[in-house]
Amino acid sequence: FKVATPYSLYVCPEGQNVTLTCRLLGPVDKGHDVTFYKTWYRSSRGEVQTCSERRPIRNLTFQDLHLHHGGHQAANTSHDLAQRHGLESASDHHGNFSITMRNLTLLDSGLYCCLVVEIRHHHSEHRVHGAMELQVQTGKDAPSNCVVYPSSSQDSENITAA
């Protein structure tokens, strides 16, 4: 399986909410001997590999933000801790998973990574990740709403998030 990032860049005004999204692609085994661990974290563009570094998002670690379930089941992060930090990660039945960040500040700008770990009984884990950039802007040059830019494999025209 692979992870797709529909958008590689999100440009948002300060104070706005944004939902960063990843999508699980390819055959996903829904059997009971496979489970998926999905999470989010901040990172840096490493020389060898993007997303190798794992930094917290608003003081919450990737472990605080994880979703853990089988196949394409829906799931949400434990609400209290995440919501106190204006965060919520979620996953649906179609392989989409996301993190919503509320009331953005300039400090939220940076590289964000989604991670999926496929876990099978008596097997090594299979890890895949996706990366996207969030730019939070302020002042007269800031957009009035978040503007999202598709990843290079998709239409290059920018799309304004609803």
Partner: antibody
């Protein structure tokens, strides 16, 4: 604060079995692997295997698959390792450690010393 | 199984010195390695993950580098409290294996 509390030291007879416990606090127990590591004086660290509580997925080091058995009880957030048919070679300190999937051994217990002696 | 080889079992250094410990994997492990510190009478502690990133709360005198099969762990200015055994470990595929350890002695 994430912590792993291990059971106390054990003095065992050759041929006996011992069950070591590792109780987790401060995180969702079922979301991380519990790793088991052996350390004999002058022998460094040896990975015995791992269990993912809740799913009971396990991976054993081939060398220890007939020696160690891993179980976990999610109602008490405790993982167990049973060592069977003990010999002097099994005298060691045994550590449990937490490993989030796709990650490293980020929190370790204090270790349980097992001594096998007649 | 992937074998992790730390060529030096012992290294002697003085406070303030720079010291580097090497680790070689028997096959390509990308950057999927960690370095652990084990002080006398204590359990190991994660210092470096993904070959070059410091774990939470680890002082910046500790650094890691390398990819593929050759890795280096460096303490830029050794402190008395750095007396410990240092282990590399790969996290590429099970079974996870550790290097034999390098004991750092402070002169």
């Amino acid at each position: 604060q994430v912590q792993l509390q291990q059971s106390g030291a054990e003095l065992m007879k050759p041929g006996a079995s011992v069950k070591i416990s590792c109780t987790a606090t401060g995180y969702t127990f079922s979301s991380c692997w519990i790793e088991w590591v052996k350390q004999r004086p002058g022998h460094g660290l040896e990975w015995l295997g791992e269990i993912l509580p809740g799913s009971d997925y396990t991976n054993y080091n081939e060398k220890f698959k007939d020696k160690a058995t891993f179980t976990a009880d999610t109602s008490s957030d405790t993982a167990y390792m049973q060592l069977s048919s003990l010999t002097s070679e099994d005298s060691a300190v045994y550590y449990c450690a937490r490993r989030p999937p796709g990650w490293y051994f980020d929190v370790w217990g204090a270790g349980t010393a097992v001594t096998v002696s007649s | 199984d992937i074998v992790m080889t730390q060529s030096h079992k012992f290294m002697s250094t003085s406070v303030g010195d720079r010291v580097s410990i090497t680790c070689k994997a028997s096959q390509d492990v990308s950057t999927d390695i960690a370095w652990y510190q084990q002080k006398p009478g204590q359990s190991p502690k994660l210092l470096i993950y993904s070959a070059s990133y410091r774990f939470t709360g680890v002082p910046d005198r500790f650094t890691g580098s390398g990819s593929g099969t050759d890795f280096t762990f460096t303490i830029s200015s050794v402190q008395a409290e750095d007396l410990a055994v240092y282990y590399c470990q790969h996290q590429y595929s099970t079974p996870w294996t550790f290097g034999g350890g390098t004991k750092l002695d402070i002169k």
